[in-house]
């Protein structure tokens, strides 16, 4: 088995809809600092033909730009290929489609390999409930508590949401 959970029981379609980014983690702090390439925020997701389509919000020049990305399915059910700032192997680590999602990416850019993890939730008012699970997954893959950034409303482009 790759990951604590593979894809959701009801299929990837259960991941469709609105999401909110809560926390990021990386072994390369520059990637998730303000203006870092992976300081991006989920807006919504949808699934089609086994691929994951995401609308993400990217802070740029004081504004937030919405960008659509597709993570393409692979032979492994919880692994996807994503081209964004290099090549990413994207893994779904823990999935509860009604409440939270933890994913991590192994990013390869030029000759550099980095690890980035992302916690997203359906309901922002419950974000504290899922931070311990995120910290646990991060620790398990070698990311420590001091490498986690918990996002604020200002961070996550709340003003750019529909």
């Amino acid at each position: 088995q790759e990951g604590n959970h593979e894809e959701p029981q009801g299929g990837l379609e259960e991941l469709s809809g609105r999401w909110h980014s809560v926390a990021l983690a990386s072994n390369k702090s520059d990637l998730i600092k303000p203006w870092g390439h992976f300081r991006v925020f989920i807006h919504s997701m949808s699934a089609k033909d086994g691929n994951l389509h995401g609308d993400i919000l990217i802070p740029q020049d004081g504004q937030c730009e919405k960008v659509s990305l597709t993570a393409f399915k692979t032979a492994t059910s919880n692994k996807f290929d994503l081209e964004y700032w290099g090549h990413n192997d994207l893994y779904l680590a823990e999935v509860d489609p009604k409440s939270y999602l933890i994913l991590y990416m192994i990013n390869q850019y030029n000759d550099d390999t980095s690890l980035v993890a992302h916690l997203m939730v359906r309901d922002l008012s419950r974000q504290q409930d899922f931070l311990p699970a995120f910290e646990s997954v991060c620790e398990d893959i070698g990311l420590h508590k001091d490498q986690i950034v918990v996002l604020s409303d200002d961070d996550r482009c709340q003003g750019s949401r529909d």
């Epitope: 390999t113 690890l115 997954v137 398990d140 070698g142």
Partner: nanobody, 122 residues
């Protein structure tokens, strides 16, 4: 300092199976991500599989996905690589490695074993 010793290699026919073991001694085994890499003659050492500290999360190279299974027993300070449906192209020296980060990049691993030879005949 962590010492790693691989075992379980050998000669096997195509389609056969082998189970490699890597015994660790030294610092706390459960604090390390563990990985397997391989190196065929005249080629670079390449990633095979990696496993998280608890064993809950595993990653594989595309070439071995579905045929190889990595696992670990933290009580025994040992990581395993079960290799099924072996092919001649799986022939290589297999190395066990320990490091701080789940990664396919060899340079992320601090400690390496001496390797065990796997030969798959057709």
């Amino acid at each position: 300092e962590v010492q790693l010793v691989e075992s379980g290699g050998g000669l096997v026919q195509a389609g056969g199976s082998l189970r490699l073991s890597c015994a660790a001694s030294g610092r706390t085994f459960s604090e390390y991500i563990m990985g397997w890499f391989r190196q065929a003659p005249g080629k670079e050492r390449v990633f095979v599989s990696t496993i998280s500290k608890s064993g809950a999360i595993t990653n594989y190279a595309d070439s071995v996905q579905g045929r190889f299974t990595i696992s670990r027993d933290n009580a025994k300070n040992t990581v395993y690589l079960q290799m099924n449906s072996l092919k001649p192209e799986d022939s290589a020296v297999y190395y066990c490695a320990a490091g701080p980060l789940l990664s396919p990049a060899g340079r992320q691993y601090d400690y390496w074993g001496q390797g065990t030879q796997v030969t798959v005949s057709s």
